[in-house]
């Protein structure tokens, strides 16, 4: 019996193939077997089917990196990592995706979901689209909507200063941030740490953060979660 999706293009298709355990999977951009990409799939949060593209959990990985590193990705997908802007751009170009952000700190948890999420191509400097908030963490990403990505060596923000340089991270900075999930782990100095402004403010570095995406219509597809 064949798989419903022999070359799953994201974690939702892997899940619809019957894979329900969170972990490493191979997906294929546009279902093209020549465009394989190893990703970490979260198969449990809110129904599962999420490609995790950022994880902060212990500060072992250096996130103060240059443009090339953020374009291509870095880290261990089982631990702390960034999947890469090129990958995010290609994945979100496949269709309509939603974003989920999970935050945890000392037994507390919060989340944010955005109905519409995409990352533009390299020419747009990976311009962010994030709309349609719901959740408990507060709508901090809205401030960054429409911004290009910024690193210390490619300053695309609207501030006089270089936001990535000032806050030792990288993000879709504006002037400068409400969200700084690639900030300095454990740094509680103002705006320097792993911040989600509307949950813990700028003077508190959050212990655990994940950003993940899945197709916006995943709920409609769930009924097909079985082998063909």
């Amino acid at each position: 019996i064949g798989l419903l999706y022999p070359f799953p293009r994201d974690c939702s298709q892997a899940m619809l193939n019957g894979d329900t355990t969170s972990g490493l999977y191979t997906i294929y951009i546009n279902g093209d077997k020549t465009q394989a990409l190893e990703v970490y799939c979260d198969m449990t949060s809110d129904g599962g089917g999420w490609i995790v593209f950022l994880r902060r959990k212990n500060g072992r990985e250096d996130f103060y990196r240059n443009w090339k590193a953020y374009a291509t990705g870095f880290g261990d997908r089982r631990e702390e990592f960034w999947l890469g802007l090129d990958n995010l751009s290609k994945i979100t170009a496949q269709g309509q995706y939603e974003l989920r952000v999970d935050l945890q700190d000392h037994g507390e948890s919060a989340y944010a979901v955005y109905d519409r999420f995409s990352v533009g191509d390299a020419k747009s400097r990976y311009k962010l689209k994030v709309e349609g908030y719901s959740g408990t963490a507060g709508d901090s990403m809205n401030y960054h909507n429409g911004r290009s990505f910024s690193t210390y060596d490619k300053d695309t923000d609207s501030a006089i200063t270089n936001c990535a340089l000032s806050y030792k991270g990288a993000f879709w900075y504006k002037n400068c941030h409400r969200v700084n999930l690639m900030g300095r782990y454990g740094d509680n100095n103002h705006s320097q740490g792993v911040n989600w402004f509307h949950w813990k403010g700028h003077e508190y570095s959050i212990q655990f953060a994940e950003m993940k995406l899945r197709p916006s219509n995943f709920r409609n597809l769930e009924g097909r979660r079985k082998r063909a």
Partner: antibody, heavy 120, light 107 residues
């Protein structure tokens, strides 16, 4: 062009109510948070209240909390401010304002204002 | 709440002179600072957003600078139409607060 037009102001006795309206045109209304800002005669600007694009989140200055209610009708491209238990110190020109993008952002478009006078 | 303190309160200035208005926040606000111009009987008009970004249509003689807690609005060469009251506003957190205003009038 982008425009905001306030209405509903007037003379009202202390303790009474008034409802201000703001009619928006020239932009996709439900994409933007909206705010009310007031200015007492001869004084500076004071932020009063704000509401998210969907209407799901509302915010108030301490001075009006529990007395004023901000709301919006996206189908009618309209913003409202229901003002109850009015006090003399609420006397001001009330402006509605549109944000540039996010909830906490600069106000790039302002209405011409509507005057509220609270006096016996 | 974040307090915004503007100085000076009044600034009599001849046409053609350089004008500098300062605004100080009671706590760190990154660059979430905006400047408005208000003329008598008119609504405020946005000049500068995010500390240094010139709003569309605003003359280039206006500029903004600063970050953190201290900010400046500069008019490089004051024109007759610039006589007005100027307000700073923090958009860092709710409630958004304004400075008390600086009145620029003719000397």
């Amino acid at each position: 062009q982008v425009q905001l037009v306030e209405s509903g102001g007037g003379l009202v006795q202390p303790g009474r109510s008034l409802r201000l309206s703001c009619a928006a045109s020239g932009f996709t209304f439900d994409d933007y948070a909206m705010h009310w800002v007031r200015q007492a005669p001869g004084k500076g600007l004071e932020w009063v209240s704000g509401i998210s694009g969907s209407g799901g989140s509302t915010y108030y200055a301490d001075s009006v909390k529990g007395r004023f209610t901000i709301s919006r009708d996206n189908a009618k491209n309209s913003l409202y401010l229901q003002m109850n238990s009015l006090r003399a110190e609420d006397t001001a020109l009330y402006y509605c304002a549109k944000v540039m993008s996010s909830m906490e952002d600069a106000f790039d478009i302002w209405g011409q204002g509507t005057m509220v006078t609270v006096s016996s | 709440d974040i307090q915004m303190t503007q100085s000076p309160a009044s600034l009599p200035t001849p046409v053609g002179d350089r004008v500098t208005i300062t605004c100080r926040a009671s706590q760190y606000i990154q660059g979430f600072l905006n400047w408005y111009q208000q003329k008598p009987g008119k609504a405020p008009k946005l000049l500068i957003y995010d500390a240094s970004n010139l709003e569309t249509g605003v003359p280039s003689r206006f500029s903004g600078s600063g970050s953190g807690t201290d900010f400046t609005l500069t008019i490089s060469s004051l024109q007759p139409e610039d006589f007005a009251t100027y307000y700073c506003q923090q958009s860092y957190s709710t409630p958004q607060t304004f400075g008390q205003g600086t009145k620029v009038d003719i000397k």
